[in-house]
Interface confidence: low
């Protein structure tokens, strides 16, 4: 339904607090380098303007689109050319090209300083002195570092952030109360950001059809009692929500997400028996809860799939009449029967089924041609099962840190051109699949592991896209969304790679390593490991293990020494020489 003033419509729907928060997120995700104060000023100006439109929807400029209003506002930033370079050229364009231009300049790896957590007392004082500014700063800092963060979900994180400070700043031991909560929010936030980044990549790189297929599979697993028509309606609405958020239309996205949550809760009986608790919560918690809700129980006595999709004489007729609907039904029926499969596996099976029908429905005897199509699924199912089994065994044998190291070596040998920080970040995250998923029973391992790996490999893809250095990465990232993981799994050592020149500076360490947290120390060691493999890609596991053991002993020894810096200088030279000899550098 058309509104005279879109900005007034969204202001009234969302309320002032959410409106301001969402505009701040939108601006920070577009202009990631702008100071906080500049963004607050822009948001206040937009909010004042929105209020005039609420009072009189016919007022001047109130009929303009949100992209026009927000884009005009962003283009008033004085330092746009100096700070953002060619992004300033976006301002010469008209909508919708201007917004597309801003979207293309979003930076997944902005050159921003690491967020350092102040002392607890300092944070509590800041929180009490000006709660509103404190929380806005949180939104701003997260949004600019994660330009695709799911905006309505960030509001939920901010609500939890506020609750943590409200509770813990009054506690006897503030730090004991607050720090675990902040750690949890940080880790959950990173995971949420990465999951949303995959949704946006799916929409932007592979199109709406790819996203809808993903959504059909996932929602059918989650709501196996819902009818196909119901799942289709939810998929359509969910696609609209994510298209809007990924496109920077955060007000529309948040508004539509709230409508979707409302619809789901009003129609629980025909969707899922697991929604009751979620639907009793306030809006932000409700939406989050629905997004994370456990799979409902499968209906009893579901008939065999073969009847409708293999044995029926009407398979080709049904397929020809409405290809995507028929394939959607196949995916729905298969997914609701298989909560034990990953979404990407279900999509591979659907693709195989589609390919078979494309070929067979043009053959002389279609039925004979597609009669054995389900036999083709077996190897596709077994491949991830075997891979997960092997890797969980390796994880249980090695523990997380050493498992990450094994993956670091594996991936550095596959794609040694990729930057060391990216290889370390991605391999560490790949390695977390062990502690995240291997503890689950067989029936939950594959959806946990393979869908998580899809999220992590997407991080590699988006970081690599910014500075492409490897044709193999480009190929695996762009050929097929659902086959990214098998594509990377299939890569062997890159024989074309010319080993990196040895640089002793890379392996020079100082006493500051002793004061680092365990995590930071691990990252230092893993960075050295990647560099070692880049220098000596043919080094064996045994050689690398020996060097890394020596390195760990060297760090431990020098951190205990009285004169740490001298120890690092002298013992470091010996270690480099010994490592060179061991690896034949």
């Amino acid at each position: 339904d058309a509104h005279k003033s879109e900005v007034a419509h969204r202001f009234k729907d969302l309320g002032e607090e959410n409106f301001k928060a969402l505009v701040l997120i939108a601006f920070a995700q577009y202009l990631q380098q702008c100071p906080f104060e500049d963004h607050v000023k822009l948001v206040n100006e937009v909010t004042e303007f929105a209020k005039t439109c609420v009072a009189d929807e016919s007022a001047e400029n109130c009929d303009k689109s949100l992209h026009t209003l927000f884009g005009d506002k962003l283009c008033t930033v004085a330092t746009l050319r100096e700070t953002y370079g060619e992004m300033a050229d976006c301002c010469a364009k008209q909508e919708p090209e201007r917004n597309e231009c801003f979207l293309q300049h979003k930076d997944d790896n902005p050159n921003l300083p690491r967020l350092v957590r102040p002392e607890v007392d300092v944070m509590c004082t800041a929180f009490h002195d000006n709660e509103e500014t404190f929380l806005k700063k949180y939104l701003y800092e997260i949004a600019r570092r994660h330009p695709y963060f799911y905006a309505p979900e960030l509001l939920f994180f901010a609500k939890r952030y506020k609750a943590a400070f409200t509770e813990c700043c009054q506690a006897a031991d503030k730090a004991a109360c607050l720090l675990p909560k902040l750690d949890e929010l940080r880790d959950e936030g990173k995971a949420s950001s990465a999951k949303q980044r995959l949704k946006c990549a799916s929409l932007q790189k592979f199109g709406e059809r790819a996203f809808k297929a993903w959504a059909v599979a996932r929602l059918s697993q989650r709501f196996p009692k819902a009818e196909f028509a119901e799942v289709s309606k939810l998929v359509t609405d969910l696609t609209k929500v994510h298209t809007e958020c990924c496109h920077g239309d955060l007000l529309e996205c948040a508004d539509d997400r709230a409508d979707l949550a409302k619809y789901i809760c009003e129609n629980q009986d025909s969707i899922s028996s697991k929604l009751k608790e979620c639907c009793e919560k306030p809006l932000l918690e409700k939406s989050h809860c629905i997004a994370e809700v456990e799979n409902d129980e499968m209906p009893a006595d579901l008939p065999s799939l073969a009847a409708d999709f293999v044995e029926s004489k009407d398979v080709c007729k049904n397929y020809a009449e409405a290809k995507d609907v028929f394939l959607g039904m196949f995916l729905y029926e298969y997914a609701r029967r298989h909560p034990d499969y990953s979404v990407v596996l279900l999509l591979r099976l659907a693709k195989t089924y589609e390919t078979t029908l494309e070929k067979c429905c043009a053959a002389a005897d279609p039925h004979e041609c597609y009669a054995k199509v389900f036999d083709e699924f077996k190897p596709l199912v077994e491949e991830p099962q075997n891979l997960i089994k092997q890797n969980c065994e390796l994880f249980e044998q090695l523990g997380e840190y050493k498992f990450q190291n094994a993956l670091l070596v594996r991936y550095t040998k596959k794609v040694p051109q990729v930057s060391t920080p990216t290889l370390v970040e991605v391999s560490r995250n790949l390695g977390k699949v062990g502690s995240k998923c291997c503890k689950h029973p067989e029936a939950k391992r594959m959806p946990c592991a393979e869908d998580y790996l899809s999220v992590v490999l997407n991080q590699l893809c988006v970081l690599h896209e910014k500075t492409p250095v490897s044709d193999r990465v480009t190929k695996c990232c762009t050929e097929s969304l659902v086959n990214r993981r098998p594509c990377f799994s299939a890569l062997e050592v890159d024989e074309t790679y010319v080993p990196k020149e040895f640089n002793a500076e890379t392996f020079t360490f100082h006493a500051d390593i002793c004061t680092l947290s365990e995590k930071e120390r691990q990252i230092k060691k893993q960075t050295a490991l990647v560099e070692l493999v880049k220098h000596k890609p043919k080094a064996t596991k045994e050689q690398l293990k020996a060097v890394m053991d020596d390195f760990a002993a060297f760090v431990e020894k020098c951190c205990k020494a009285d004169d740490k810096e001298t120890c690092f200088a002298e013992e470091g030279k010996k270690l480099v020489a010994a490592s060179q000899a061991a690896l034949g550098l």
């Epitope: 591979r348 693709k351 195989t352 390919t355 078979t356 494309e358 070929k359 054995k372 036999d375 083709e376 077996k378 190897p379 596709l380 491949e383 190929k475 050929e479 097929s480 086959n483 098998p486 594509c487 799994s489 299939a490 890569l491 062997e492 890159d494 024989e495 074309t496």
Partner: nanobody, 123 residues
Framework: EVQLLESGGGLVQPGGSLRLSCAAS????????IGWFRQAPGKEREGVSC????????NYADSVKGRFTISRDNSKNTVYLQMNSLRAEDTAVYYC????????????????WGQGTQVTVSS
Amino acid sequence: EVQLLESGGGLVQPGGSLRLSCAASGFTLDYYAIGWFRQAPGKEREGVSCIASSGGSTNYADSVKGRFTISRDNSKNTVYLQMNSLRAEDTAVYYCAAAVLECRTVVRGYDYWGQGTQVTVSS
């Protein structure tokens, strides 16, 4: 380096047989479907046969059904095309190509291509 290398082509009389091989280096074929294609002078490249990564699914162009057989030996990282009852119209350069997991319906769906091997059927 990722490479596919075809071999086994040559000159053969009508009714004769040849066995083409497609050997992969730089990656393992276990996760790849392999397609055989051919291109005769002045004609478009056309699909001949394909075998899915599992080996469980194969397909053939109508013109070669019953005469050609595709197979794979993952331990040797090689796929074979056995061509019997060869005809003059089978003369072409034969290429193998790899795609992750499944056969593709379009030529551009394949990730890696070999350089090709010439097959000539003539008396």
